[in-house]
């Protein structure tokens, strides 16, 4: 297929990415499912300057983004290396916290009111970022 | 006219394979996620699958995971369904629908179905 | 899976009369709650999305309202065209999930 040249409807445009801001909460994982059925994966940060962009956007408001460890280490959903890559938590955190009394630890990470990250309960209903490559967002994959 | 029609049902033994296509019209088909969606007679409705627009993310109920594939060629304008190792408990009306913009779980536009008989 | 429960499971209505149906939902789904028409041997036809919102060409006497486990659909003034099944659809979560619907009759 031909690549995209401009986002999606009511998608934002920044740095060669497409951004969609929800409005409305979901757990993690159906966050994960939503940015998933647009062809596109929950917010992965790379950089301040994307970490502004977002935060800008979604305002002082609890954001889900596609970082979590879930099955151990921390891990970006579209493979980008975490250890190497940009950071920008809270003070103290992560800290996989199990006072809630939700069962669990904590172990999907969120953009706070002040935009740095903590990790949470994946269960909370919280708003999300979707993303996609603008050179991804219109290839077509093969057909099996 | 906005329109989306199913084929392929049919009778098929206990163990069987048939594959359902669905011929979509009058909309920019690779923009919309598309969902099948089947009712066993006198049931209520049961989503099966659904798959993004470009095809690259499909997404299963548990009891046709393994067993059922969704797919979808946009320069064709047309969804499958291919169903293998096919259960007495699969007969249904199969529906192809088209989800919302942003609302992908609501289908605004349904085929007229396809009968699956699943029987020996 | 999100359960889905409907009620009443049959009613009967005068044309003119004014019904009500509810829907819940096993857990918090905000407002992605759906509701469908279906007529014998015909597909699903949308009326209501995201709870409350009505679909293009739907007519105003249907509406929906709710949020978080307990929706409400609503027929202000019942027309004869209007016997059918109606069901109430999460999309919350996957897998999506549909009740098992509410037929409506004329008395």
């Known amino acids: 297929g031909s690549e995209r040249t401009c986002c999606p409807v009511n998608w934002v445009e920044h740095e060669r990415s497409c951004y969609w801001f929800s409005r409305s909460g979901k757990a993690w994982a159906d966050a994960d499912n939503y940015c998933r059925l647009e062809d596109a994966h929950l917010v992965v940060v790379t950089s301040w300057e994307e970490q502004k962009f977002v935060q800008h956007h979604i305002g002082p408001v609890n954001t889900w983004m596609g970082l979590h460890d879930q099955n151990g280490p921390w891990k970006w959903v579209d493979g980008t290396d975490y250890e190497t890559g940009f950071k920008n938590w809270r003070p103290e955190q992560p800290d996989d916290w199990y006072g809630h009394g939700l069962g669990g630890g904590e172990d999907c990470a969120h953009f706070t009111d002040d935009g740095r990250w903590n990790d949470d309960v994946c269960q909370r209903p919280y708003r999300w970022v979707c993303e996609t490559e603008l050179d991804k967002a219109s290839q077509e994959p093969p057909l099996l | 006219e906005v329109q989306l029609l199913e084929s392929g049902g049919g009778l098929v033994q206990p163990g069987g394979s048939l594959s359902l296509s669905c011929a979509a019209s009058g909309f920019t088909f690779r923009s919309y996620v598309m969902s099948w969606v089947r009712q066993a007679p006198g049931k209520g409705l049961e989503w099966v699958s659904a798959?993004?627009?470009?095809?690259?993310?499909?997404f299963y109920t548990d009891s046709v995971k393994g067993r059922f594939t969704i797919s979808r060629d946009n320069s064709k304008n047309t969804l499958y369904l291919q169903m293998n190792s096919l259960r007495a408990e699969d007969t249904a009306v199969y529906y192809c629908?088209?989800?919302?913009?942003?609302?992908?779980?609501?289908?605004?536009?349904w085929g007229q179905g396809t009968m699956v008989t699943v029987s020996s | 899976d999100i359960q889905m429960t409907q009620s009443p499971s049959s009613l009967s209505a005068s044309v003119g009369d004014r019904v009500t149906i509810t829907c819940q939902a096993s857990?918090?789904?905000?407002?992605?709650l759906n509701w469908y028409q279906q007529k014998p041997g015909k597909a699903p036809k949308l009326l209501i999305y995201?709870?409350?919102n009505l679909e293009t060409g739907v007519p105003s006497r249907f509406s929906g309202s709710g949020s978080g486990t307990d929706f409400t659909f609503t027929i202000s003034c019942v027309h004869p065209e209007d016997i059918a099944t109606y069901l109430c659809q999460q999309y919350d979560n996957l897998p999506f999930t549909f009740g098992p619907g509410t037929t409506v009759d004329i008395k």
């Open positions: 629908a088209k989800g919302i913009t942003g609302s992908h779980g609501a289908f605004d536009i």
């Open positions: 798959i993004s627009g470009r095809g690259s993310n499909t």
């Open positions: 995201d709870a409350s």
């Open positions: 857990r918090d789904i905000t407002f992605y």
